[in-house]
């Protein structure tokens, strides 16, 4: 057992059928000795007496709140949340496996830039007795400051006859350069709890790894004389780390029509322009990755050809 | 500690082409060495990331954008004293910060040439014969050396009497190819941003 | 199985035209750029030019602009070069070569050669 | 118009060792440039396109890297049936422009 916060623990139990369970005691947060009795949850049946209360927690009926008493007085508080190990592995029954870009991925992260600013998001089924905790830092035996926010839902959507929560928290390195070269990656905890359910996830990865600019700006067309050539031009997005000599982008430029499986004219290119073919009812879209370190690719950004 | 402004024209900065090829070979050797070593902790998630120029040049800081020397936390105390003529420089008006930087990568270079030359001469010996150093890296390293055209003394290759263990070298290679392709990516933007001002 | 078949070899004087065919099979026919290349004896690989059989859209190397054109019949899924004002030193083999996206080929015609002699 | 330069025009490899072929641009061309593998009396055939991608159908072997001006086709160990011509494209402007070819001869 371990305090996840102040009068919250977490009773760690290996979950097979029959299992013994945990032997856990609890002591009442008061200077009182005599007269205090316990109860859990709503119920008012006095499970024991005493400044303390052994329990054998096998079961989520053995969790919950446990509050000591003394003449109708509370007087005080112990959450035990149960966090379930079967065969060897902790359980992730609360949030969903993205499977990307492996299988057993729970919590993905993406940065804009090099600045030290990052946002992970992560998928439930769950919609209700639902809360997240996060914290961050750079290693882990020496951990170096980084401060997320509070973890807020960012997107329902309909998965079939499933609702689908997203999650999803910002986090910012505290003392952050763009030009460092990292050695030690940025861990991310999740602490998931649903009503008595405790669990945790993690991810660790460089800022480099998760790059994902955004979309380049400002696309413009302008058509050649005498030709079905079009020039496309665009600027790197706001968001880009500066300066852009040494923060370079290369982009892919790509003319297609509305279906993937139709026709298309595609090239890379360094510079901020390129020239391609138009074609009716086809759109010109544009995507940009950082040009030294190959990590994603940004969204499209689009405009139509006509 | 910083990048000026003023310096050589983009025409004028042979550099740049030789770093672009740098980058790529080692990402190729990289790429090769995580196929042909795939029972071996190899990605860069398995591998302890150790940095063999620590505390002995400080390229990033002396390659540093003026536009970052804003930011307090690009700003490290680590002095380093370099040797400051190079053919990189290409203009008289070339400011010693910018002598120190591209110094700073000349000693990267040699530091890293000297440890892959000795660990392929231990991957030569290995019976497997399963991975060795692509030659067109080495040659790239070379090249991108003698464009900076710097005169410092010789480190002389490591040599070691005892019989190699084949499974640490490899993993050692894979240790330094990581760090040597992070080294790599920050000089494509020096030369990037040098050959731009 | 996407297949290009090409007509025959020709033979031709200097100063006339040459008409190349290039049939297609497997797939639909305008879902592709169709592009023409051609190689002397013994040289290497020159670009002449594409159609979008979908809009009959076209673009020519401007070597060969003015005496190239090509054309296509979506009916027939039928692609046409033709060359005119003959020059010995057009002799070489056309290929016909298709790929959804513009800029390079995946499929190619087994070759026409053309040889044009006094 | 962009000058594709390749070398060397020929290439004599023993069955079994690696071959790498090097094609260069006269600017800039970021990764648009493809390589194709060409037969005596035979059309073009596909082999690595945008510099690096693999197509389906064609053995692992066969490998493309480089970017900018600088391109490498790179063959891991030479089969009997490799034995042709390889000629790379480039793709990043008009005209569409080809290499002289590189022919890989039996040493």
């Known amino acids: 057992i371990w305090e996840l916060k102040k009068d919250v623990y977490v009773v760690e139990l290996d979950w097979y059928p029959d299992a013994p369970g945990e032997m856990v005691v609890l002591t009442c947060d008061t200077p009182e000795e005599d007269g205090i009795t316990w109860t859990l949850d709503q119920s008012s049946e006095v499970l024991g007496s005493g400044k303390t209360l052994t329990i054998q927690v096998k079961e989520f009926g053995d969790a919950g709140q446990y509050t000591c008493h003394k003449g109708g007085e509370v007087l005080s508080h112990s959450l035990l949340l149960l966090h379930k190990k079967e065969d060897g592995i902790w359980s992730t029954d609360i949030l969903k496996d993205q499977k990307e870009p492996k299988n057993k991925t729970f919590l993905r992260c993406e940065a804009k830039n090099y600045s030290g600013r990052f946002t992970c998001w992560w998928l439930t089924t769950i919609s209700t007795d639902l809360t997240f905790s996060v914290k961050s830092s750079r290693g882990s035996s020496d951990p170096q400051g980084v401060t997320c926010g509070a973890a807020t839902l960012s997107a329902e959507r309909v998965r079939g006859d499933n609702k689908e929560y997203e999650y999803s928290v910002e986090c910012q390195e505290d003392s952050a350069c763009p030009a460092a070269e990292e050695s030690l990656p940025i861990e991310v905890m999740v602490d998931a709890v649903h009503k008595l359910k405790y669990e945790n996830y993690t991810s660790s990865f460089f800022i480099r790894d998760i790059i994902k600019p955004d979309p380049p700006k400002n696309l413009q067309l302008k058509p050649l004389k005498n030709s079905r050539q079009v020039e496309v031009s665009w600027e790197y997005p706001d968001t880009w780390s500066t300066p852009h000599s040494y923060f370079s982008l290369t982009f892919c430029v790509q003319v297609q029509g509305k279906s993937k499986r139709e026709k298309k004219d595609r090239v890379f290119t360094d510079k901020t322009s390129a020239t391609v073919i138009c074609r009716k009812n086809a759109s010109i879209s544009v995507r940009a990755q950082d040009r030294y370190y190959s990590s994603s690719w940004s969204e499209w950004a689009s405009v139509p050809c006509s | 500690r910083n990048l000026p402004v003023a310096t050589p024209d983009p025409g004028m900065f042979p550099c740049l082409h030789h770093s672009q090829n740098l980058l790529r070979a080692v990402s190729n050797m990289l790429q090769k060495a995580r196929q042909t070593l795939e029972f071996y902790p190899c990605t860069s998630e398995e591998i302890d990331h150790e940095d063999i120029t620590k505390d002995k040049t400080s390229t990033v800081e002396a390659c540093l954008p003026l536009e970052l020397t804003k930011n307090e936390s690009c700003l490290n105390s680590r002095e380093t004293s370099f040797i400051t003529n190079g053919s990189c420089l290409a203009s008289r008006k070339t400011s010693f910060m910018m002598a120190l930087c591209l110094s700073s990568i000349y000693e990267d270079l040699k530091m890293y040439q000297v440890e892959f030359k000795t660990m392929n001469a231990k991957l030569l010996m290995d019976p497997k014969r399963q991975i060795f150093l692509d030659q067109n890296m080495l040659a790239v390293i070379d090249e991108l050396m003698q464009a900076l055209n710097f005169n410092s003394e010789t480190v002389p290759q490591k040599s070691s009497l005892e019989e190699p263990d084949f499974y640490k070298t490899k993993i050692k290679l894979c240790i330094l190819l990581h760090a040597f392709r992070i080294r790599a990516v920050t000089i494509d933007r020096v030369m990037s941003y040098l050959n731009a001002s | 199985q996407v297949q290009l078949v090409q007509s025959g070899a020709e033979v031709k004087k200097p100063g006339s035209s040459v008409k190349v065919s290039c049939k297609a099979s497997g797939g639909t026919f305008s879902d592709y750029y169709l592009h023409w290349v051609r190689q002397a004896p013994g040289q290497g690989l020159e670009w002449m030019g594409w159609?979008?059989?979908?809009?009959?859209?076209?673009e020519y190397a401007p070597k060969f602009q003015g005496r190239v054109t090509i054309t296509a019949d979506e009916s027939t899924s039928t692609a046409y070069m033709e060359l005119s004002s003959l020059r010995s030193e057009d002799t070489a083999v056309y290929y016909c070569a298709r790929n959804k996206e513009l800029r390079y080929f995946d499929v190619w015609g087994q070759g026409t050669l053309v040889t044009v002699s006094s | 118009d962009i000058v594709m330069t390749q070398s060397p025009l020929s290439l004599p490899v023993t069955p079994g060792e690696p071959a790498s072929i090097s094609c260069r641009a006269s600017q800039s061309i970021s990764i648009n440039l493809h390589w194709y593998q060409q037969k005596p009396g035979q059309a073009p055939r596909l082999l690595i396109y945008?510099?690096?991608q693999s197509i389906s159908g064609v053995p692992s072997r066969f490998s493309g890297s480089g970017s900018g001006t600088d391109f490498t086709l790179t063959i891991s160990s030479l089969q009997p049936e490799d034995f042709a011509t390889y000629m790379c494209q480039q793709s990043n402007s008009f005209p569409l422009t080809f290499g002289q070819g590189t022919k890989v001869e039996i040493k």
């Open positions: 945008f510099a690096s």
């Open positions: 159609i979008d059989p979908e809009n009959g859209d076209t």
